[in-house]
Amino acid sequence: DGCKDIFMKNEILSASQPFAFNCTFPPITSGEVSVTWYKNSSKIPVSKIIQSRIHQDETWILFLPMEWGDSGVYQCVIKGRDSCHRIHVNLTVFEKHWCDTSIGGLPNLSDEYKQILHLGKDDSLTCHLHFPKSCVLGPIKWYKDCNEIKGERFTVLETRLLVSNVSAEDRGNYACQAILTHSGKQYEVLNGITVSITERAGYGGSVPKIIYPKNHSIEVQLGTTLIVDCNVTDTKDNTNLRCWRVNNTLVDDYYDESKRIREGVETHVSFREHNLYTVNITFLEVKMEDYGLPFMCHAGVSTAYIILQLPAPDFRAY
């Protein structure tokens, strides 16, 4: 069918609550495109009827709510005037929430379920709630170790929980809860977050900052050698790992046999209040299979990607 396959995302979710995933893939979706969602390579698109439990809402796929049997690979097909991309999203549904039981709970937490607070500082936790405009979210309640959070050190501000004068006792398992309203029906959303405490002074917030790349595409000729730096600022003596990944795998592991794409040796420059880290990715020879694939730079919980793109034909040569 001429569509380029992109294997993008592994999401781990709790059953019995709403979930939405937006099919955005810069730079593909920045122009005039049509987006269609499918499940498990079905030829029949996901319904667009808003009364359906699973339906497409503009570029989103929306589950109201997610159920145990919804696990699987979903594809969103993005068709432009001259292009077609098929993005595969692997959704794994887990039945139980941690505060109900430890059985059948979320295994192997990904970075989005982990957040850091800085000891002695005023800091905050974020409740990640990503839904289309058709979903209205009510005020957020916060829980720690399965009990509702109360006390003057804690303030709820939109999707954030502000924590003043962070102490070691603030580590633990948090959850944020909101009521989502869609087409007159109400649903509960509950997101778990595991929180650790660091003593290091924050620089520019509580997470590493990726200066470059910035989720963009790079035009590069087929067969050329390419080196791309990932530049990260982070606190001094931080314990974050910085690396390049593709398809959720370290590039050195992914290209273990060919060694065609490698991660470089990390270097850093020390400033008074922070460090600037650089770790590069080297493409010894750019191949067709590299185009359109997000190469992700990871720094702790922060990520940014580059996508290689064939240069537009230069008609002046003809």
Epitope: S102, I103, G104, G105, P107, D145, C146, T194
Partner: antibody, heavy 119, light 108 residues
């Protein structure tokens, strides 16, 4: 380091009750579920149930439902498992074990408490 | 409930030999939720392999786990004297949690 220290061996008569304790140290007691398991002499392991020390929520194996009660005292980081209406086939070693968020397995176990039910 | 059946019940081998322990589930278990524990007489069980194939802290690399769905295997590539013990598989997917009846690995 993480430690789960259980109370000593008990000898009980049929029909009586036994309360086994499990004192936790080296981690935040209220952040992890505590489970209990039974191992009869020369037999395999059998799950009894779990308690969340902060919310006190419990989930029991139906086989033990009605006879088991799990409680905790957060001030001393201790979990308890009480088994009532004891029978001779309750003679076993009872273990507590801890489960962490995002790690659904028993990474830490108590040393075990032998309960002997005999007339 | 999910019933886990381990085979063989007893395995008699000599040090240096390869051991293969099997665990079969009565219904499908996600690989994230299938674990193995080692137990020696008079001791508490000890986590050995978690999530089907990940070795717990300090477990030597001669131990490996594999499998999916209803069939799981614990393999010891070259038996050492300290490996002789009872091994239990366990599922953490649904309540009640269940263990296999154990495989006793004994010196031949």
């Amino acid at each position: 380091q993480v430690q789960l220290v259980q109370s000593g061996a008990e000898v009980k008569k049929p029909g009586a009750s036994v309360k086994v304790s499990c004192k936790a140290s080296g981690y935040t007691f209220t952040s992890s579920w505590m489970h209990w398991a039974k191992q009869a002499p020369g037999q395999g392991l059998e799950w009894i149930g779990e308690i969340h020390p902060n919310s006190a929520k419990t989930n029991y194996n139906q086989k033990f439902q009605g006879r088991v009660t799990m409680t905790r005292d957060t001030s001393i980081s201790t979990a308890y498992m009480e088994l009532s209406r004891l029978r001779s086939d309750d003679t076993a070693v009872y273990y507590c074990a801890r489960v962490d968020y995002g790690k659904p397995w028993f990474a830490y176990w108590g040393q075990g408490t032998l309960v002997t039910v005999s007339s | 409930q999910i019933v886990l059946t381990q085979s063989p019940g007893t395995l008699s081998l000599s040090p240096g030999e390869r051991a293969t322990l099997s665990c079969r589930a009565s219904s499908s278990v996600s690989s994230s939720y299938l674990h193995w524990y080692q137990q020696k007489p008079g001791q508490a069980p000890r986590l050995w392999i978690y999530s089907t194939s990940s070795r717990a802290t300090g477990i030597p690399d001669r131990f490996s786990g594999s499998g999916s769905g209803t069939d799981f295997t614990l393999t010891i590539s070259r038996l050492e004297p300290e490996d002789f013990a009872t091994y239990y598989c366990q599922q953490f997917q649904s309540s009640p949690l269940t263990f296999g009846q154990g495989t006793k690995l004994e010196i031949k």
